[in-house]
C-alpha cells in the first residue's frame, strides 16, 4: 500500500520538522535556486487517505520559510505527504515533496530557560507552555547540564506529569566565586542528535555567610 506522490523533485529542498516550545514546526531550505521565491505555499495529505492536497491555511502565500503544523499534524503514526510550492510573483518556481512521520522525523529543540546565581547554588527556571497536547509529549526527558572548569555534570530532574507550565530546578552544592555555565535540552530515546541550548553563564558571588539550598532533585 503506498501513496505515490506527484512527480515533484524532493531534491531541491531540505525539510526539517522540529518540536519548538512543544509546537510542531516544519522549516525548509532551498538548494541551488538561482531565483529566490517571494512566497511559498505548503500543502499536504495523509497517506492513509490520499485525498486532494490540502493547503495549510496559515502557510498559504507565506514569505516565511517555516510553518506551524501543530493543529494540522496530530498523529505520530500517519505519513504526512507534504508538498512545498515556491513562487515568484504569479510564477511557480518549483515544487518539492517529502513524507514525514512525526515519531521518526521529529527533532527536539531545547526549551527556553533562565538562570539566577546565588552564593552556592543556581536556580534554573525552565519555561514550558501552559498546556501541552498528549501526542506532543514524545517520551521526552529534560536534561540540565552544569559546566565549570571543564567538568560537565548532567542533571535529570524528575518532572511529575506533563512538561507544562514553568519548572524550577536548583543546582546546589556549588563553589562560591566560581563561573558556572548551564545548558538545557530535551532528550529522546533515539538517534536524532540532541539539540542543546546555548550556554548561559553566571559568576557566583563570593561566599560570606554559609548558605544552603533545598535541592529540588
Amino acid at each position: 500500500i503506498s501513496y505515490d506522490s506527484p512527480d515533484y523533485t524532493d531534491e531541491s529542498c531540505t525539510f526539517k520538522i522540529s518540536l519548538r516550545n512543544f509546537r510542531s514546526i516544519l522549516s525548509w531550505e532551498l538548494k541551488n535556486h538561482s531565483i529566490v521565491p517571494t512566497h511559498y505555499t505548503l500543502l499536504y495529505t495523509i497517506m492513509s487517505k490520499p485525498e486532494d492536497l490540502k493547503v495549510v491555511k496559515n502557510c498559504a502565500n507565506t514569505t516565511r520559510s517555516f510553518c506551524d503544523l501543530t493543529d494540522e499534524w496530530r498523529s505520530t503514526h500517519e505519513a504526512y505527504v507534504t508538498v512545498l510550492e515556491g513562487f515568484s510573483g504569479n510564477t511557480t518556481l518549483f515544487s518539492c515533496s517529502h513524507n514525514f512521520w512525526l515519531a521518526i522525523d521529529m527533532s527536539f529543540e531545547p526549551p527556553e530557560f533562565e538562570i539566577v546565581g546565588f552564593t552556592n547554588h543556581i536556580n534554573v527556571m525552565v519555561k514550558f507552555p501552559s498546556i501541552v497536547e498528549e501526542e506532543l509529549q514524545f517520551d521526552l526527558s529534560l536534561v540540565i547540564e552544569e559546566q565549570s572548569e571543564g567538568i560537565v555534570k548532567k542533571h535529570k530532574p524528575e518532572i511529575k506529569g506533563n512538561m507544562s507550565g514553568n519548572f524550577t530546578y536548583i543546582i546546589d552544592k556549588l563553589i562560591p566565586n566560581t563561573n558556572y555555565c548551564v545548558s538545557v535540552y530535551l532528550e529522546h530515546s533515539d538517534e536524532q542528535a540532541v539539540i542543546k541550548s546555548p550556554l548561559k553563564c553566571t559568576l557566583l558571588p563570593p561566599g560570606q555567610e554559609s548558605e544552603s539550598a533545598e535541592s529540588a532533585k
Epitope: I1, S2, Y3, D4, S5, D10, F15, M47, S48, R74, S75, T76, H77, E78, A79, V81, H98, N99, F100, W101, A103, I104, D105, E134, E135, D139, S189, D190, E191, Q192
Partner: antibody, heavy 119, light 112 residues
Framework: QVQLQQSGAELVRPGTSVKVSCKAS????????IEWVQQRPGQGLEWIGV????????KYNEKFKGKATLTADKSSSTAYMQLSSLTSDDSAVYFC????????????WGQGTSVTVSS | DVVMTQTPLTLSVTIGQPASISCKSS???????????LNWLLQRPGQSPKRLIY???KLDSGVPDRFTGSGSGTDFTLKISRVEAEDLGIYYC?????????FGGGTKLELK
Amino acid sequence: QVQLQQSGAELVRPGTSVKVSCKASGYAFINNLIEWVQQRPGQGLEWIGVINPGSGNVKYNEKFKGKATLTADKSSSTAYMQLSSLTSDDSAVYFCARDGYYLGTMDHWGQGTSVTVSS
Amino acid sequence: DVVMTQTPLTLSVTIGQPASISCKSSQSLLDSDGKTYLNWLLQRPGQSPKRLIYLVSKLDSGVPDRFTGSGSGTDFTLKISRVEAEDLGIYYCWQGTHFPWTFGGGTKLELK
C-alpha cells in the same frame, strides 16, 4: 507489485561485521518506511528498528543500539542494516519489511537473510 | 516494553473446523490518535512472514474473509471460521503503538 529482495546468506567470524541489503521495487522507495526484524533459530520475532529512506532518520530498539546501523540509498532504492561486533547470539534470520499506510504495520516482508556467526 | 502474550502455544485443528487465537498486551494499545496498532501475521514453514490483519480488524487484500480480527485495549483475538490446509503455520500478533514494537511468542496451528 511490491517486492523486497534481500541479500544472500552470510557465514561470518565472531568480532566482524556484516551488511545486509534490502532492495525495494514496485513502489516509490522514499514514500514508505523500512523496518528490520530479527528471528533467532526456533525463536519468535524481535524488532530492531525503522528508517525513513527519504530523510535517513532512524529509530532503534534500545536493545540493538550499537549493534545495528540502518541506512538507505535513495538512488538504488536499497535499505541496509549493518551488524557489528558479531557474536554467536547474532546468528539469526533478519527480515526487512515495508510499512504501509501507518508506522509499525509492516505490510510487505523480504524473504529474510540468514546470518551465521561461527569461528 | 509492552509484553505480548499469545495463547495457546499450539493449536491442533481439523480441516474445516474453527480456530481462535488470543493475544493480550501488558498495556493498552490504543494510541492518542484513536487507532489501535495491533497486527497479525502468518509465517508458514520456511517462508517469510505475511501480514494478515492490521489495526485490529482490517484484512489485507487477498486474505480470505474466513479470517477475522477483533478486540480493543489489551485483549485481542484472531479467528478462522473454517481452517484450510494453507492456514497452517505460526501466527504472531504484534503491536506498533509503543516503541519498541513487540511480538507475541507465536501460536503454531497444526493438524490434529
